[in-house]
């Protein structure tokens, strides 16, 4: 048994980092293999990840971690029973996927505008709070052309949009993704996203 | 909001040994380290140990082996840290103080008054 | 007896800019990173900046950390004269056995 492709993390930096590998043939990740990690500080205790298959040779774990902060760093062993097949070690700052936003909502109620919200998945004592900025996706149901980004560079999770810039009388979707440039993070995943019926008066035409 | 409350001021004679507590609210409690730090008066800041408190390891610095015991009563959020061998220098204000390699909080300190 | 060495007090009239220096070595500061607490009179210390530059949520902007080489700076603009206090830095090392330094303190007095 060898694996073929090293593990590669990444960290919410918060309370979890996922680590993907590939072995050299099918394997029952979970009765077959265990991650041990352990933080490199004073005191730190050894932790074990039992593994999920992820397709027929690919393994995925799911570490669990605490205060997780930009000094940390992590010795990972891989193990096959008493067979250390991989050793290596990983920085979660250094490899940050974001959570991914949550309570997407589309404010239809206020005059001709299109007010969206969503929540920050991160709590305020955590650094990554006040570093997000955000992608909102919208496009329509009915025409896959018409899709557009929106960039969010500023720190209230919220969008403001004029609804004619839609078009009147279809039903479109929008879903919200985030990341951060302190640390130079990959975008998180696509937030559930959220559908409106879009219509507004279209002004009078003298 | 994050709370670390300290038991209150003590006095004691020389030789004698001082327990002070420090509750924590408001976190996970055995998810972050807990440091206790003395500042003896019109002085500075020395720290003087950790304990992690998920399994009640401890490491002391270096100068108050053997005379202080740093534990933990998950079941109540509590550390405590106890000083034997009191002496007139260790008068200080002792402070318990939430994280690992900086302190994100601190309790509002115990004032240990040594006296003869 | 601390390990990073501070001056022992700077001052500045409100408004203006001030800096405090902490000076550590290879096994401290020059292999960690370094914070900074404040301590008003007669109370606990806060934390002010960690990681050498980041600032925790509350804390506004006109604190700012910096780290080179063995040292590290604080450095405040706008003075106020809510920012009279003690200032410590810290730092972890790791030479011999893990320990948790602390600056020798600045007092910072506003005109």
């Known amino acids: 048994m060898k694996v073929l492709q090293e593990p590669t993390c990444v960290s919410d930096y918060m309370s979890i980092s996922t680590c993907e590998w590939k072995m050299n043939g099918p394997t029952n990740c979970s009765t077959e293999l265990r991650l041990l990690y352990q933080l490199v500080f004073l005191l730190s205790e050894a932790h074990t990840c039992i593994p999920e298959n992820n397709g027929g040779a690919g393994c995925v774990c799911h570490l669990l971690m605490d205060d997780v902060v930009s000094a940390d760093n992590y010795t990972l062993d891989l193990w096959a029973g008493q067979q250390l097949l991989w050793k290596g070690s990983f920085k979660p700052s250094e490899h940050v996927k974001p959570r991914a936003p949550g309570n997407l909502t589309v404010h239809t109620n206020v005059s001709d505008t299109l007010l969206l919200t969503w929540s920050n998945p991160y709590p305020p004592d955590n650094y990554l709070y006040n570093h997000l900025t955000y992608a909102v996706n919208i496009w329509s149901e009915n025409d896959p052309a018409d899709f557009r980004i929106y960039n969010v560079t500023y720190l209230e999770p919220s969008l403001r949009i004029a609804a004619s810039t839609l078009k009147s009388g279809i039903s479109y979707r929008a879903r919200v993704r985030a990341w951060a440039q302190c640390y130079n993070t990959t975008w998180s995943e696509w937030s559930p996203s959220t559908k409106w019926h879009n219509s507004y008066r279209e002004p009078f035409e003298q | 909001q994050v709370q670390l409350v300290q038991s209150g001021a003590e006095v004691k004679k020389p030789g004698a040994s001082v327990k002070v507590s420090c509750k924590a609210s408001g976190y996970a409690f055995t998810s972050y380290y807990m440091h206790w730090v003395r500042q003896a008066p019109g002085q500075g800041l020395e720290w003087m140990g950790i304990i992690n408190p998920r399994g009640g390891s401890t490491s002391y610095a270096q100068k108050f082996q053997g005379r202080v015991t740093m534990t933990r009563d998950t079941s109540t959020s509590t550390v405590y840290m106890e000083l034997s061998s009191l002496r007139s220098e260790d008068t200080a204000v002792y402070y318990c103080a939430r994280g690992k390699y900086w302190m994100y909080d601190w309790g509002k300190g115990t004032l240990v008054t040594v006296s003869s | 007896q601390s390990v990073l060495t501070q001056p022992p007090s700077v001052s500045a009239a409100p408004g203006q800019k001030v800096t405090i220096s902490c000076s550590g070595g290879s096994s401290n500061i020059g292999n960690s990173y370094v914070s900074w607490y404040q301590q008003l009179p007669g109370t606990a210390p806060k934390l002010l900046i960690y990681d050498n530059n980041k600032r925790p949520s509350g804390i506004p902007d006109r604190f700012s950390g910096s780290k080179s080489g063995t040292s590290a700076t604080l450095g405040i603009t706008g003075l106020q004269t809510g920012d009279e206090a003690d200032y410590f830095c810290?730092?972890?090392?790791?030479?011999?056995?893990?320990?948790?330094?602390f600056g020798t303190g600045t007092k910072l007095t506003v005109l």
């Open positions: 810290g730092t972890w090392d790791t030479s011999t056995v893990w320990e948790w330094p």
